[in-house]
Amino acid sequence: FSIMENNGQPCINDDEEMKEVDLPEIEADSGCPQPVPPENGFIRNEKQLYLVGEDVEISCLTGFETVGYQYFRCLPDGTWRQGDVECQRTECIKPVVQEVLTITPFQRLYRIGESIELTCPKGFVVAGPSRYTCQGNSWTPPISNSLTCEKDTLTKLKGHCQLGQKQSGSECICMSPEEDCSHHSEDLCVFDTDSNDYFTSPACKFLAEKCLNNQQLHFLHIGSCQDGRQLEWGLERTRLSSNSTKKESCGYDTCYDWEKCSASTSKCVCLLPPQCFKGGNQLYCVKMGSSTSEKTLNICEVGTIRCANRKMEILHPGKCLA
């Protein structure tokens, strides 16, 4: 019995000099013992003895994938021909970081492409990159286990003043983007309505320029600008913001009618539609999802629905006519 019967064209495997028919005949009881799989791998067609010419397939445990040629071939001398094959982790393990750092989102495992953000307590910043992405089985950029928090120079400079300002004698004046922002400060993704473009800016520079009355600068999110839903929403919210009656300063950001400033994180968080107060004369006529019917919503409801990424078409400002 042979898994490759000689009833057709003898086959030659890649990088194999010998044809199947050229293999010497052997006793039925000889063959190859079970091979040792790579770490985190196992033999799919497991048995005690394999015939000469028989292949075994290497599979990997969940969370790992095979890299290299995943078949071993039983040779006449009772050994296995095996290429370089290993089981590589397809997920990243939660990194071990200093206790002072907070990992968001906090999970045990992260899939390829997922990112984490490291943050520090108020008044401190990460002494290095704050955003890391799972690529293959490791984090990019690599996470140093000595990574820690350092006193935010912005906080040191500002004294009792607002962000973007510094103490000058007994009064508060705007920081100079050139003179006061030579130190490291975390990256922010910022939108400039004048140039209609977004870019990554150090927090210090953004706040200093905003203080100098550059109203065209809008905070999008913490971290460098990266394509995705967060950036998309940041841009959309900037467009909606021009009609907002509420403009509440919150950390780097400004919160609008459909948002609340989180006291613990100093970030604007979208309300959920039921949390919207009916008041306000900023109304929109919209179509929800695949519905054909029109609906009048206030700016808060529109903001919360778009923030939640629910499908909604704004037909026109003001009440629906019907």
Partner: antibody, heavy 118, light 112 residues
Framework: EVQLVESDGGLVQPGGSLKLSCAAS????????MAWVRQGPGKGLEWVAT????????YYRESVKGRFTISRDNAKNTLYLQMNSLRAEDTATYYC???????????WGHGTLVTVSS | DVVLTQTPSTLSVTPGQPASISCRSS???????????LYWYLQKPGQSPQLLIY???DLGSGVPNRFSGSGSGTDFTLKISRVEAEDVGIYYC?????????FGQGTNLEIK
Amino acid sequence: EVQLVESDGGLVQPGGSLKLSCAASGFTFSDYYMAWVRQGPGKGLEWVATINYDGSSTYYRESVKGRFTISRDNAKNTLYLQMNSLRAEDTATYYCARPSTEALFAYWGHGTLVTVSS
Amino acid sequence: DVVLTQTPSTLSVTPGQPASISCRSSQSLLNDVGNTYLYWYLQKPGQSPQLLIYLVSDLGSGVPNRFSGSGSGTDFTLKISRVEAEDVGIYYCMQASHAPYTFGQGTNLEIK
């Protein structure tokens, strides 16, 4: 001060109907979405339904869709829950709740017990 | 539906001692714009639930600052720095990141 007072519940046979009401005071009722949340005996809490300011939009949990109807009368500052085709698993204390910018269920009524049993 | 699992189910604490309750979600509560809608409620015996913490870590109006919330993704914690007799009752976590809104099964805090 925000006050939410549910009407008395009661004992209903399986398949029967009951209408709950919730009288609201201390705030402008028509300015807020409203909701019903229930709690089975010795069980956890369960969101039931939500209604927008004027009743033009309603939302229900899957298990009560088609059987329960949430409605409101802004002139009377009253929220309602019409419950039809009642089942034993609908036995619970029903709370009416109002949101705030802090949470969806920031203010709660004292609750009313509905028992579905033969 | 998102399942929230609270541990422990019962907690017995001496007044003045700290207490910690865990709430684990069957899927991440962090949405794609970076918001997490996780709340903590306390239901005192014979009363309606009252809001303690909203948006993971913000203190509800009038809530003593011995209560604090933390966590992200799927793991959340409510901490009481020093338990007082009036803190007895059932603590519930609730999520509104995914429809329908769901609550944990509750953790009963009793005084030793």
